[in-house]
């Protein structure tokens, strides 16, 4: 028979055969064989894999350093990563929670809907088409685009959701 | 290399008033929206009060509100807080930072003693 140029779900292609994926938890010791399945052995404490896969080595879990002000939100398992969240009364700087502050600033192309308070953290939103923040803050609302026409100008260059617009003087039409 | 060293704190009778400085280097001070947060002892960090790029605008804790004012001279690369009619519980180190405040840097604080 011809040899497989693609295989099934849950397998892989290697020396002309497939092989079956290890599965979540397990890494890949030894490729399978015309005679033999393949070998796979379970990720050791403090390790993970969180997909059927052909890695020979497990991820290391997250480390939630308290020196960042991390601690651990879910402990991590054989298939899942430990999940870090920031001590109370800090917050997370990104969804991956890598380091913490006492609160959050929008990003440019963000502003504050809410500023923070005592208990609660900054809330951001996405600046609408017509306005802009070109900075990172923890307490600016997106800006309106300067109007052009209002200084007799026209538009020169369009804003977007972190820049504002170009203005420049109307071309005049010679007689 | 950031370095933020707050100074100005010392023992207050309540009633009192004192004004902390916070000298800033190794950024471009006036590109950064700043605040001063507040340790009492064995309590966590608390908010206190943060102030715009140009000083515009200001933004207080309920518990600070109409007592505290905060500042900044952007040619001095420093930041103010006016602290009037101080409370027992106003008793705190006092640090200044750069807004978002990092919890692995807090810098030089100076401590506010308020008692009689």
């Known amino acids: 028979p011809e040899p497989p140029t693609a295989c099934r779900e849950k397998q892989y292609l290697i020396n002309s055969q497939c092989c079956s994926l290890c599965q979540p938890g397990q890494k890949l010791v030894s490729d399978c064989t015309e005679f033999t399945e393949t070998e796979c052995l379970p990720c050791g404490e403090s390790e993970f894999l969180d997909t059927w896969n052909r890695e020979t080595h497990c991820h290391q879990h997250k480390y939630c350093d308290p020196n960042l002000g991390l601690r651990v939100q879910q402990k991590g398992t054989s298939e899942t990563d430990t999940i870090c969240t920031c001590e109370e009364g800090w917050h997370c700087t990104s969804e991956a929670c890598e380091s913490c502050v006492l609160h959050r600033s929008c990003s440019p192309g963000f502003g504050v809907k809410q500023i923070a308070t005592g208990v609660s953290d900054t809330i951001c939103e996405p600046c609408p088409v017509g306005f802009f923040s070109n900075v990172s803050s923890a307490f600016e609302k997106c800006h309106p685009w300067t109007s052009c026409e209002t200084k007799d100008l026209v538009v020169q260059q369009a804003g977007t959701n972190k820049t504002d617009v170009v203005c420049g003087p109307q071309d005049r039409l010679r007689a | 290399e950031v370095q933020l060293l707050a100074s100005g704190g010392g023992l207050v009778q309540p009633g009192g008033s004192l004004r902390l400085s916070c000298a800033a280097s190794g950024f471009t001070f006036e590109e950064e929206e700043m605040i001063w947060v507040r340790q009492a002892p064995g309590k966590g960090l608390e908010w206190v009060s943060s102030?715009?790029?140009?000083?515009?605008?200001?933004y207080y804790a309920d518990s600070v509100k109409g007592r505290f004012t905060i500042s900044r001279d952007n040619s001095k690369n420093t930041l103010y807080l006016q602290m009037n009619s101080l409370r027992a519980e106003d008793t705190a180190v006092y640090y200044c930072?750069?807004?978002?405040?990092?919890?692995?840097?807090w810098g030089q604080g100076t401590l506010v003693t308020v008692s009689s």
């Open positions: 930072g750069k807004e978002p405040f990092r919890y692995d840097y």
């Open positions: 102030i715009s790029r140009s000083g515009g605008s200001t």
